[in-house]
């Protein structure tokens, strides 16, 4: 049965040119965390592999970088980066969590975080 | 040009080990993540691990998780897999295969051209 | 563990004609998917990765396509070559790495 829950940085706002970090915490389970995959709609950015460590897509090296932790720095921000992003752990015996972030990324500086909120 | 040439049959007794070499050639070895993969009589096909060849980092298949140990020695261009406290079900061709590029993450461009191991008292 | 999952488990096809083969993935793997072909005694071969990027040497008889968990190798019109197994393999997530069950395609 799966009893974990994963919280993440929710709704969030940031800069155009700026950078903003992506955060996922997996609670309320044992569960061994075998990976990390870290998406931008049905695109993969980056890998987190408990035996072998980060992977950073190709197409995304120059502006994604690993951490803090299991989470994901996006860097040079463009009004293009708006949208879904989700963190999908890979767990074993438990099976996939995947948690959800919905970034704006905005032209002006009134750029401001949003709530946490909870995926169950 | 690139292969991968791996060492010859073996035939081993229930609770033995196995060790199979693959010997890369034609590219920078250290840069591609190396695989492998063993395939039962008639059967389909079984990823085992892989090994990063540049600093030795390895990840196995739960199945194998304490029975297996795949190592590496630079100089030589060469990966190697062990096998430990074999049974008749481990009686397989074991493949050894080069993925990605140890920066990211890729299918298995080339092919070592097996071993086949032999479980038997 | 992703399980990849084949159909059908046997394709029989008449040469010149087309085969389709199918693969399903249990969760989404982008296009994090390949295709392998293998004759019997020989190690398997790359047709195609990402999904649908055919491998150096491939003929362009052969294209993949799919994204997500959906995913299909086309054989546009079968040579007497072409007749084989033929396996799909999810490379994004691990351990472990996972393939299907295999399709063999063979002669009607």
């Known amino acids: 049965m799966m009893t974990g829950t994963i919280e993440t940085t929710g709704n969030i706002s940031a800069e155009k040119g700026g950078s903003i970090i992506l955060q996922c915490h997996l609670s309320s389970t044992t569960a061994q965390v075998t990976q990390v995959n870290w998406e931008q709609q049905d695109q993969l950015l980056a890998i987190c592999n408990a035996d072998l460590g980060w992977h950073i897509s190709p197409s995304f090296k120059d502006r994604v970088a690993p951490g803090p932790g299991l989470g994901l720095t996006l860097q040079s921000l463009t009004v293009n980066d708006t949208g879904e992003y989700f963190c999908i752990y890979h767990t074993y015996p438990d099976g996939t969590y995947t948690g959800r972030i919905f970034l704006e990324v905005l032209e002006s500086s009134v750029a401001e975080h949003g709530a946490r909120f909870q995926i169950p | 040009q690139v292969q991968l040439v791996q060492s010859g049959a073996e035939v081993k007794k229930p609770g033995a080990s196995v060790k199979v070499s693959c010997k890369a050639s034609?590219?920078?070895?250290?840069?591609?993540?190396m695989h492998w993969v063993r395939q039962a009589p008639g059967q389909g096909l079984e990823w085992m691990g892989i090994?990063?060849?540049?600093?030795?980092?390895?990840s196995y298949a739960r199945k194998f998780q304490g029975r297996v140990t795949m190592t590496r020695d630079t100089s030589t261009s060469t990966v190697y897999m062990e096998l430990s406290s074999l049974r008749s079900e481990d009686t397989a061709v074991y493949y050894c295969?080069?993925?990605?590029?140890?920066?990211?993450?890729?299918?298995?461009?080339?092919w070592g051209q097996g071993t086949m191991v032999t479980v038997s008292s | 563990e992703i399980v990849m999952t084949q159909s059908p488990a046997t394709l029989s096809v008449s040469p010149g004609e087309r085969a389709t083969l199918s693969c399903r993935a249990s969760?989404?793997?982008?296009?994090?998917l390949a295709w392998y072909q293998q004759k019997p005694g020989q190690a398997p071969r790359l047709l195609i990765y990402?999904?649908?990027t055919r491998a150096t040497g491939i003929p362009a008889r052969f294209s993949g396509s799919g994204s997500g968990t959906e995913f299909t190798l086309t054989i546009s019109s079968l040579q007497s070559e072409d007749f084989a197994v033929y396996y799909c393999?999810?490379?994004?997530?691990?351990?472990?790495?996972?393939f299907g069950g295999g399709t063999k395609v063979e002669i009607k």
């Open positions: 969760q989404s793997v982008s296009s994090n």
């Open positions: 090994i990063n060849p540049s600093i030795g980092l390895t």
């Open positions: 034609g590219y920078t070895f250290r840069e591609y993540y």
């Open positions: 393999q999810q490379y994004v997530v691990w351990p472990p790495l996972t």
């Open positions: 295969a080069r993925g990605g590029r140890t920066t990211w993450i890729g299918a298995f461009d080339i």
């Open positions: 990402g999904a649908s």
